[in-house]
Interface confidence: low
């Protein structure tokens, strides 16, 4: 932050945020803030890594190639084209101009957000962006908007990153085809840090009798505005491949009910390759409270997508017009059609026809909830809270907000305190059956609405037309997995701030990783679920998984995991440890055997003890060191990255439309 450029009110705001005196002349305020910033500056030795996510390196502009690579190994290696990381929005400004800082803890906030003042109906005043000021997500209110720009949508202006120590550096490493999710997870787990427990999520005083976007029934990477009627997904790096969904807080099971959704902006995702199918798309509709956020991809989940298709249970059919930025979709549920419920949609007031007919008997009296699923689009709802509808509403239909409270059904309400929340940390080698257990456990405890945090779950959100991106993915599969791992790191950070139930579906075999990952969830019921099958079963499962998914984790990585496998114990960061297959005693024996096997196999073939520094801050510019965390580089330079933050070209290839 350049203190000299801040206006008096901005200086005061920054000081107030830090609990400092806000009185005095501009020069005094600037001096006070500068001193505070210097005090906050991390030491040179502080490790910045994937979990810290300091935003985008200062020298990088989305359209400028990287300069100044690593001097360590040959020439500079910029990240593959199109995947330069960019700063994530610090938060989302609601009508009162405050930010809901959902996703970043103050300690890690390397950039400051400024509120844009609304200038007129059709646009916003912009401050000039300088090279080092990286642009965060900002809905660009275009002048051709059919409706006036909604006043509630005042996003952050830009992210101004701290200079120094943010050179984007990279190292070459041999390309390895078979790097799957387990591999990147393994590299991630070998690093050690002790993040601070996150700040508590802001508890807004929000009138719960209003129909709103439900902050509990939405994806972690879907950011809800303070007014709870608009939101947007994270779009940085790998998040741009992800669908992000949210449901409304209330549903209906009778009457003729409607709501509207407006696409406020298609958020710029220049880091996506041009081959990515439908980089901007919204799916809107209705689903049951028990459904996942992947609208239209399971039974009782009904969506109309921007590609003009309707879908339920992942069956996609041509239906209506395509829709995009600035379009308004009206969603209508008619429960007064005899034995059926009819769902239909309008685009900008024009009726698209009946999309779905659902037998009331099949619904079994369950309520349907407004639901949106977005990819790189900011959306706004009208549940009836606006004085006027955006567009024509079908005669005889009532906005859901206008129904009496007794006619609306509240969706599942989340836990009130962290003490009511569970985090189940899976522990087990690749292919042990962690994901299988996690999915089954979540399904058999629907009331807990477990959020599964794992690369597998993230890959599930990277679907195209309801299909997972398979190994025949046109871009580099390992890069996609890598991006999923980055997303996961960020989601874990966000998760620790939200009162929900989680299953952390990773290998978590390193003792250090177990501690590090559980620490931010202080206050939760923290449990480890150890899945340790017999060695024979593990081998069978590994073969089965290799047959189904391709080789996921290189043998040397599995051996290193075996060498370092530590069974967790109840203690300062775990309240309970459950063994699912082999019980403690047998598991202990097997793990000792694995430790021995792994140690005998020796270090992995590449750079195990390469303790040279360099490589920018961890994981940003690229390859960096592949060394054990105990062997740190010299104080002068941060350790190399665990993964190439810049990623590869990703992107679509041979898929049907979105």
């Amino acid at each position: 932050m350049d203190v000299r450029r801040l206006k008096v009110n901005e200086l005061r705001e920054e000081l107030q945020r830090r609990g400092l005196d806000t009185r005095g002349l501009k020069a005094e305020l600037a001096e006070r803030l500068q001193a505070a910033l210097e005090a906050e500056e991390p030491d040179d030795e502080r490790e910045l890594d994937a979990d810290d996510e300091p935003g985008r390196p200062g020298h990088i502009n989305e359209e400028v190639e990287t300069e100044g690579g690593s001097e360590l190994e040959g020439t500079a290696q910029p990240p593959p084209p199109g995947l330069q990381p960019h700063a994530e929005p610090g938060g989302y400004s609601g009508p009162d101009g405050h930010y809901a800082m959902d996703n970043i803890t103050r300690q890690n906030q390397f950039y400051d957000t400024q509120v844009i003042k609304q200038e007129n109906e059709s646009g916003y005043e912009r401050r000039p962006l300088e090279m080092e000021q990286q642009q965060a997500y900002r809905p660009e209110m275009k002048t051709e908007m059919k409706q006036g720009a909604p006043t509630s949508f005042l996003p952050p202006e830009a992210s101004q990153l701290k200079p120094d120590r943010q050179q984007f550096q990279s190292r070459k490493r041999p390309y390895e085809e078979n790097r799957g999710r387990g591999y990147f997870e393994h590299r991630e787990d070998r690093r050690g840090r002790s993040p601070q427990p996150p700040a508590e999520e802001d508890e807004d005083d929000f009138d719960d009798t209003l129909v709103a976007i439900d902050t509990y029934n939405c994806d972690l990477h879907f950011k809800v505005a303070r007014d709870r009627s608009s939101g947007y997904p994270l779009t940085i790096e790998g998040f741009a491949y992800l669908w992000s969904g949210a449901r409304a807080s209330y549903g209906v099971r009778r009457g003729r009910v409607c709501f509207e959704m407006k696409i406020n902006e298609e958020i710029s995702v220049k880091h996506l390759p041009s081959t990515e199918p439908d980089p901007h798309v919204v799916r809107i509709g209705w689903s049951l409270d028990s459904c996942s956020t992947q609208l239209g991809e399971e039974p009782f989940s009904y969506g109309y997508g921007g590609t003009g298709k309707k879908s339920t249970n992942s069956r996609f059919e041509n239906y209506g017009d395509k829709f995009a930025e600035n379009d308004v979709i009206g969603c209508f549920a008619d429960f007064e059609c005899g034995n059926d419920v009819e769902l239909s949609f309008t685009k900008n007031g024009k009726w698209m026809g009946i999309a779905f007919r659902i037998q009331k008997e099949a619904l079994g009296g369950q309520a349907l909830y407004p639901h949106v699923l977005v990819k790189n689009c900011a959306v706004e709802f009208n549940f009836g809270q606006r004085a006027e509808p955006y567009c024509s509403v079908l005669p005889g239909f009532t906005f859901i907000q206008h129904l009496p409270l007794s006619e609306r059904i509240r969706g599942t309400v989340g836990p009130k305190s962290k003490a009511e929340c569970e985090i189940l940390m899976m522990v087990g080698l690749p292919a042990a059956g962690k994901t299988t257990w996690a999915i089954k456990h979540a399904a058999s405890n629907p009331s807990k609405k477990y959020n599964i945090l794992g690369t597998n779950a993230i890959m599930d959100k990277m679907r195209v037309m309801g299909l997972r991106r398979q190994r025949n993915y046109a871009g580099r599969w390992d890069v996609l997995i890598q991006q999923a791992t980055q997303c996961l790191n960020r989601l874990i950070q966000i998760a620790a701030r939200k009162k929900r139930n989680y299953i952390l579906d990773q290998t978590n075999v390193y003792g250090s990783a177990q501690r590090r990952k559980m620490r931010p969830f202080e206050g939760f019921q923290r449990k480890a679920i150890v899945i340790c099958p017999t060695d024979e079963d593990l081998k069978d499962r590994t073969i089965k998984r290799t047959d189904e998914e391709g080789k996921d984790v290189p043998d040397h990585a599995v051996l290193e995991m075996k060498a370092n496998f530590t069974l967790p114990d109840v203690g300062d960061f775990l309240d309970e440890v459950l063994f699912i297959e082999l019980q403690r005693e047998e598991a202990d024996k097997l793990v000792r055997q694995y430790n021995e096997e792994g140690r005998k196999a020796g270090p992995p073939p590449e750079k195990r003890f390469d303790n040279r520094g360099g490589g920018g801050f961890r994981g940003r510019g690229g390859g960096g060191g592949f060394q054990r965390y105990e062997n740190r580089g010299p104080p002068g330079g941060n350790r190399g990255g665990f993964q190439n933050r810049g990623g590869g070209s990703g992107g679509g290839g041979n898929y049907r439309g979105g």
Epitope: K146, F332, C337, G338, S344, T346, N348, G349, K350, W351, G353, I354, R357, E388, P389, C391, S392, V393, L394, P395
Partner: antibody
Framework: QLQESGPELVKPGASVKISCKAS????????ILWVKQSHGKSLEWIGN????????TYNLKFKGKATLTVDKSSSTAYMQLNSLTSEDSAVYYC???????????WGQGTLVTVSA | DIVMTQTPKFMSTSVGDRVSVTCKAS??????VAWYQQKPGQSPKELIY???YRYSGVPDRFTGSGSGTDFTLTISNVQSEDLAEYFC?????????FGAGTKLELQ
């Protein structure tokens, strides 16, 4: 596409049934509206029918005068006009409607002439 | 019933001109207004729905505006093929009602 039946010349007091055959889309997914246009005059909405259920909505002015029906098997909508008088001489249009009540696609119209 | 009062009844124009037709609803109809064009011997064709949205395939010289009770259809750069009768319609509530029409003629 909506194809209406040909012109009708009928005597006062008689009835007439005009048809509107839909093609090129799913007939049961869109309502059919009927509109009257007297010579040199404006348009008057008669009513709609939802082909899926056969449910109807009428303009009170035409209740008893017009009866709307559909035959799903042939994707055809019908309007019967009863107790005809010279006032009923007009062009009658069927249109594929939106639930919103706008008329997206129109038939070519059927001229009904009531004359002794 | 909602009455839609359309003015003028007739309008003379030349190719290239800009013309406006207005429609006044007897009560607030929000933006629930459509405009239709009817050429002699043909059935009507929808131009505008929801007050300001052009139906697909409609040239952008046709624009609709207004909300509440006052609505306008504007044709900028009139072409000879635009000579027709224009009707407004409200679909805020049943019964659906139309304006009396405006005939656009060449001077």
């Amino acid at each position: 596409q909506l194809q209406e039946s040909g012109p009708e010349l009928v005597k006062p007091g008689a009835s007439v049934k005009i048809s509107c055959k839909a093609s090129g889309y799913s007939f049961t997914d869109y309502i059919i509206l009927w509109v009257k246009q007297s010579h040199g005059k404006s348009l008057e909405w008669i009513g709609n029918i939802n082909p899926y259920y056969g449910s109807t909505t009428y303009n009170l002015k035409f209740k008893g005068k017009a009866t709307l029906t559909v035959d799903k098997s042939s994707s055809t909508a019908y309007m019967q006009l009863n107790s005809l008088t010279s006032e009923d001489s007009a062009v009658y249009y069927c249109a594929r409607g939106d639930l919103t009540g706008t008329f997206a696609y129109w038939g070519q119209g059927t001229l009904v002439t009531v004359s002794a | 019933d909602i009455v839609m009062t359309q003015t003028p009844k007739f309008m003379s124009t030349s190719v290239g001109d800009r013309v406006s037709v207005t429609c006044k609803a007897s009560q607030n109809v929000g933006t629930y207004v459509a405009w239709y064009q009817q050429k002699p011997g043909q059935s009507p064709k929808e131009l505008i729905y929801s007050a300001s949205y052009r139906y697909s395939g409609v040239p952008d010289r046709f624009t609709g505006s207004g909300s509440g009770t006052d609505f306008t259809l504007t044709i900028s750069n009139v072409q000879s093929e635009d000579l027709a009768e224009y009707f407004c319609q409200q679909f805020n509530s049943y019964p659906l009602t139309f304006g009396a029409g405006t005939k656009l003629e060449l001077q």
